[in-house]
């Protein structure tokens, strides 16, 4: 992937739109939308003023760890859906799109240098462990997905892209 493709806001917006669509189709869906287990996902909240004071490398650590955990969670959701007796087709479609989207975003972040940045800061090892929450429905899973994209990921790429412009 071109190194700074993710710096084009339209790219992230495309994935965000997909995530919001997925969240919307699960609104009010009970019958097909339970995960039947608790899946660990990243907490999409941040300590606002601490985040603002963070080095971009520390932000990269949080985003990279969060993206990895979110990818695992969506893959687990996909596996549970495949194993269910009658997977609901619209849900299947959006889970597959989310898996594909997270793979692409991982590639785009790697191209931006997020992985390298996440490893390089001297305080990366002492960074606080990633805060997590659990999701027991596809609605919660997709909400975390869309909140992660429009939250930490957008904040980090904005900062990383700005830093790269200097």
């Amino acid at each position: 992937a071109p190194p700074r493709l993710i710096c084009d806001s339209r790219v992230l917006e495309r994935y965000l739109l997909e995530a919001k669509e997925a969240e919307n189709i699960t609104t009010g869906c009970a019958e097909h939308c339970s995960l039947n287990e608790n899946i660990t996902v990243p907490d999409t909240k941040v300590n606002f003023y601490a985040w603002k004071r963070m080095e971009v490398g520390q932000q990269a650590v949080e985003v990279w760890q969060g993206l990895a955990l979110l990818s695992e969670a969506v893959l687990r959701g996909q596996a549970l859906l495949v194993n269910s007796s009658q997977p609901w087709e619209p849900l299947q479609l959006h889970v597959d799109k989310a898996v594909s989207g997270l793979r692409s975003l991982t590639t785009l972040l790697r191209a931006l240098g997020a992985q390298k940045e996440a490893i390089s800061p001297p305080d990366a090892a002492s960074a606080a462990p990633l805060r997590t929450i659990t999701a027991d429905t596809f609605r919660k899973l997709f909400r975390v997905y869309s909140n992660f994209l429009r939250g930490k990921l957008k904040l980090y790429t904005g900062e990383a892209c700005r830093t790269g412009d200097r």
């Epitope: 999409t44 909240k45 941040v46 300590n47 606002f48 003023y49 601490a50 985040w51 603002k52 004071r53 909140n147 992660f148 429009r150 939250g151 930490k152 957008k154 904040l155």
Partner: antibody, heavy 127, light 108 residues
Framework: QVQLQQSGPGLVKPSQTLSLTCAIS??????????WNWIRQSPSRGLEWLGR?????????DYEVSVKSRIIINPDTSKNQFSLQLNSVTPEDTAVYYC?????????????????WGQGTLVTVSS | SYVLTQPPSVSVAPGQTARITCGGN??????VHWYQQKPGQAPVLVVY???DRPSGIPERFSGSNSGNTATLTISWVEAGDEADYYC???????????FGGGTKLTVL
């Protein structure tokens, strides 16, 4: 339940210093997620944010540009309170002054909001 | 500095729906918070992050935000809803909160 109790004089002479205190109960001024603010309200300027203090491994202050040269917000950890000092006041500084807590542990796509407020103190600047 | 524009007053009959607007350049891309202030009292947060309600705030209070306008909607208006309402956003250029001028809601 967080409560903020304000104290301080209601009348200040021009060119003098306005001093107010906000005592916190139900939370800590050294909280690692909240920020502690002063906001004022007057008929001519509406609600106007003045500044904040917060602790994230060390103390930080942010001030509104228009008052930056004459404002100090100080935390007092021993009394679990924070104070406002506004120097060289003029009649334009006449307003109701509020202290307020800003919740800072929020969704990453959001911005902090004021979830608890003091009762307000009307401060009149007049000789 | 980012400017928020609110109508000075809105009137509504009890049981009807009140809509209070807050205008700002591309406000839809920002998070909007709403406060209610009754005479002689401090403001109270009624909606945050465009549409979320703090605990204790009735479901009658809801919010939306897109384009250049954010809206606070109060359904089944009661006499006790009569107050001033303020919107608030974050001015990212100066890293500080900005308030709208306020809207006086009158229940007829």
């Amino acid at each position: 339940q967080v409560q903020l109790q304000q104290s301080g004089p209601g009348l200040v002479k021009p060119s003098q210093t306005l001093s107010l205190t906000c005592a916190i109960s139900g939370d800590s001024v050294s909280s690692n997620s909240a920020a502690w603010n002063w906001i004022r309200q007057s008929p001519s300027r509406g609600l106007e944010w003045l500044g904040r203090t917060y602790y994230r491994s060390k103390w930080y202050n942010d001030y509104e540009v228009s008052v930056k040269s004459r404002i100090i917000i100080n935390p007092d950890t021993s009394k679990n309170q924070f104070s406002l000092q506004l120097n060289s006041v003029t009649p334009e500084d006449t307003a109701v002054y509020y202290c307020a807590r800003e919740e800072g542990y929020i969704e990453a796509h959001s911005v902090p909001y004021f979830d608890y407020w003091g009762q307000g103190t009307l401060v009149t600047v007049s000789s | 500095s980012y400017v928020l524009t609110q109508p000075p007053s809105v009137s509504v009959a009890p049981g009807q729906t009140a809509r209070i607007t807050c205008g700002g350049n591309n406000i839809g891309s920002k998070s909007v918070h709403w406060y209610q202030q009754k005479p002689g009292q401090a403001p109270v947060l009624v909606v945050y992050d465009d549409s979320d309600r703090p605990s204790g705030i009735p479901e009658r209070f809801s919010g939306s935000n897109s384009g250049n306008t954010a809206t606070l909607t109060i359904s089944w208006v009661e006499a006790g809803d009569e107050a001033d309402y303020y919107c608030q956003v974050w001015d990212s250029s100066g890293d500080h909160p900005v308030f709208g001028g306020g809207t006086k809601l009158t229940v007829l």
